[in-house]
């Protein structure tokens, strides 16, 4: 699991690769702060609850965020 609270940032390693939006349990976007100077995106997968850190600068990940927000806006009344 690429997560650690012993460093200032949560993510140790990040991926440029997207995941299937339907496989996502939760997508957390943690803004940059005094503790971590960069935006962090943590995807929690439905299967086994595995957490993955995604690169917010990757175009493929931006496409994923777009797809997720589109899906959410469809669901909300």
């Amino acid at each position: 699991v690429p997560l650690s609270r012993t460093v200032r940032c949560t993510c140790i390693s990040i991926s440029n690769q997207p995941v299937n939006p339907r496989s996502l349990e939760k997508l957390e976007i943690i803004p940059a702060s005094q503790f971590c100077p960069r935006v962090e995106i943590i995807a929690t997968m439905k299967k086994k609850g595995e957490k993955r850190c995604l690169n917010p600068e990757s175009k493929a990940i931006k496409n994923l965020l777009k797809a997720v927000s589109k899906e959410r806006s469809k669901r909300s009344p």
Epitope: N16, Q17, P18, R52, N63
Partner: antibody
Framework: EVQLVQSGAEVKKPGATVKISCKVS????????MHWVRQAPGKGLKWMGW????????TYADDFKGRFTFTLDTSTSTAYMELSSLRSEDTAVYYC????????????WGQGTTVTVSS | DIQMTQSPSSLSASVGDRVTITCKAS??????IAWYQQKPGKAPKLLIH???TLQPGIPSRFSGSGSGRDYTFTISSLQPEDIATYYC?????????FGQGTKLEIK
């Protein structure tokens, strides 16, 4: 040099199954997602979907759900595309293509595998 | 899904001519378009990405432009080796879409 080398041409009967391989070299296999593209004879390119090479999770385009299966063997840096219950309309050239995820376009392609379905 | 309408489907031009191919997206694709060249029996080859960025080793006679929904691919001076089919690809989306292709022939 970055290379994607696909398996050779296949001739199959309707109802059979075919499995195409795409072996990569020249880069770290798990750094980029792998996509599959179909080209029917005399037709254009059609995107089939992708597989996340870190997790092995496949995602299929709507027209390619059901009979298509994308898998990996990370130990040999190889991606596979399996197609079952073959029909004559599956006759096509199938390409694997590396997705440069940071910018998200396909930068390197395999040479293509011709699948012919004929009774 | 985003549709990409590519035109013309075929065109005939002479060596030295300026050739233009267009792709129109069904919605704004934010310049995320790539152009590929495919010769018979070969895999597509990336020429341009992000509307106008030329891949290393690609001759400068190839160029791209556009924004929003409308994009153009240009060959400033057609060479015999440019005979091929050209495709646009939109990648502003998790669901990738190709244009229908333009078959380029020499007059």
């Amino acid at each position: 040099e970055v290379q994607l080398v696909q398996s050779g041409a296949e001739v199959k009967k309707p109802g059979a199954t075919v499995k195409i391989s795409c072996k990569v070299s020249g880069y770290t296999f798990t750094d980029y997602s792998m996509h599959w593209v179909r080209q029917a004879p005399g037709k254009g390119l059609k995107w089939m979907g992708w597989i996340n090479t870190e997790t092995g999770e496949p995602t299929y385009a709507d027209d390619f759900k059901g009979r298509f299966t994308f898998t990996l063997d990370t130990s040999t840096s190889t991606a596979y595309m399996e197609l079952s219950s073959l029909r004559s309309e599956d006759t096509a050239v199938y390409y694997c293509a590396r997705n440069y995820d940071y910018d998200a376009y396909f930068d390197v392609w395999g040479q293509g595998t011709t699948v012919t379905v004929s009774s | 899904d985003i549709q990409m309408t590519q035109s013309p489907s075929s065109l005939s031009a002479s060596v030295g001519d300026r050739v233009t191919i267009t792709c129109k997206a069904s919605q704004d694709i934010n310049k995320y378009i790539a152009w590929y060249q495919q010769k018979p029996g070969k895999a597509p080859k990336l020429l341009i990405h992000y509307t106008s960025t030329l891949q290393p080793g690609i001759p400068s006679r190839f160029s791209g432009s556009g924004s929003g929904r409308d994009y153009t691919f240009t060959i400033s001076s057609l060479q015999p080796e440019d005979i091929a089919t050209y495709y646009c690809l939109q990648y502003d989306n998790l669901l990738f879409t190709f244009g229908q292709g333009t078959k380029l022939e020499i007059k």
